[in-house]
């Protein structure tokens, strides 16, 4: 906390500017209006401050809106972001887009903070679900985004959202993700033809029923060893020996290499042997 | 953790020349800002001179303009501070200061401080 002590004379600021990089704590906590700076805070970030300089300027916007920042003030935040605190950011109401662009800027390339995850929160409740224009935001500065929302949270999700995401982005998902996602993606992608389907499903498999992986094995859809050992196990364990082979088409041959690791493991000992030697893979139920 | 360290300090004649040095154990091409600040005994800490690298603007206190030169070296990540015809009220401890962007370094808005360097001017 800046001890609070009287503008010397002839330093009163008039407007925020650079020659307040010049001004020690103190002074700037004397000398510059706090409503000043929230209508001039699109100019803090251009001038050179030192974040200490930065925590001072938070202190008098704190002053200023003790019940929270209005957005006019947030969106023009930038650095100054990385100075709030979770609790800070709770008394916020973030509504727009673009503020949210602007300060995810200021995170960007690095991890998701408690401050930014928080900044998210409050935005997605305040919208009521998420779009997939704030889906797209979102996934763009955090590929992982989607799979760090709970099965509950995904529920809120709107089909017409699943367009924005790319196959990146459900890397880290866990199967119970998948099951509340995969219904979503077959609804939105339910227009397309055989084979651009595949392309766009594909990353949402590991949460499809069996009777859907028997209707792609129909559609000569090549399924790679990859995608084929994030199914589940519950949905592939009752295929038919004929049906994983047209599901895999060519890649069938990989089988071998993956027949100790689930979901090939446990499937294999479910088939016939006769069955499993018409593959000519040598795998052993 | 960024580590900086000044040299160059020292004893010296009004009028005078020194070069400070501050070597940075990280990258500072990738600073937001860097600064050299100077404190004299029993006085407050000023800002001396000022690099902000996203617009490569430099910023110096009415007290050393014309006087004193701020620059960096990416290369070998060192700040520097070129003071001429210096004067007896330069006496102090020299600070360089480095602000990262939040991405580098953790994430964490903070501004890296070094040890300092003490410049005294006296005939």
């Known amino acids: 906390e800046v001890e609070k002590t009287a503008c010397p004379s002839g330093k009163k600021a008039r407007e925020i500017d650079e020659s307040l990089i010049f001004y020690k704590k103190w002074e700037l906590e004397a000398c510059v209006d706090a409503a000043l700076l929230a209508t001039q805070m699109d100019r803090v970030n251009a001038i050179p401050f030192t974040y200490e300089q930065l925590d001072v300027l938070k202190h008098k916007l704190d002053e200023l809106y003790p019940q929270g920042y209005p957005e006019s003030v947030i969106q023009h935040l930038g650095y100054l972001f990385l100075k709030m605190s979770p609790e800070d950011i709770r008394k916020w109401n973030v509504t727009s887009l673009e503020t949210l662009k602007a300060l995810l800027e200021v995170n960007k390339g690095h991890e998701m903070s408690p401050q930014v995850a928080t900044l998210i929160d409050r935005f997605v409740k305040g919208r009521g679900q998420l779009d997939k224009d704030t889906l797209d935001t979102l996934t763009a500065f955090y590929p992982g985004y989607l799979c760090s929302l709970s099965p509950e949270e995904l529920s809120s999700v709107p089909p017409s959202s699943i367009w924005a995401v790319r196959p990146q982005d459900l890397d880290t998902c866990d199967p119970r993700q998948l099951d509340v996602l995969y219904p979503k993606a077959r609804l939105a992608f339910q227009n397309m033809n055989g084979s651009e389907y595949f392309v766009k499903i594909q990353s949402f498999l590991g949460g499809a029923p069996t009777e859907d992986l028997k209707a792609l094995s129909q559609q000569n859809v090549s399924m790679d060893l990859a995608t084929f050992m994030k199914l589940r196990t519950d949905a592939v364990l009752p295929l038919t020996v004929a049906e994983v082979q047209k599901l895999l088409g060519p890649h069938v041959e990989g089988l071998k290499a993956e027949e100790r690791h689930r979901p090939v493991r446990d499937w294999i000992l479910r088939q016939r042997q006769d069955d499993l030697d018409t593959l000519g893979l040598g795998l052993q139920g | 953790q960024v580590q900086l360290v000044e040299s160059g300090g020292g004893v010296v004649q009004p009028g005078r020349s020194l070069r400070l040095s501050c070597a940075a154990s990280?990258?500072?091409?990738?600073?937001?800002?860097m600064h050299w600040f100077r404190q004299a005994p029993g006085k407050e800490r000023e800002l001396v001179a000022t690099?902000?690298?996203?617009?490569?603007?430099?910023y110096y206190a009415d007290s050393v303009k014309g006087r004193f030169t701020i620059s960096r070296d990416n290369s070998k990540n060192t700040l520097y501070l070129q003071m001429n015809s210096l004067r007896a009220e330069d006496t102090a401890v020299y600070y360089c200061?480095?602000?990262?962007?939040?991405?580098?370094?953790?994430?964490?808005?903070?501004?890296?401080w070094g040890q300092g360097t003490l410049v005294t001017v006296s005939s």
């Open positions: 990280g990258t500072i091409s990738t600073a937001r800002t």
């Open positions: 690099i902000s690298t996203g617009t490569n603007t430099y």
């Open positions: 200061a480095v602000s990262y962007y939040p991405n580098e370094y953790d994430g964490v808005p903070y501004d890296y």
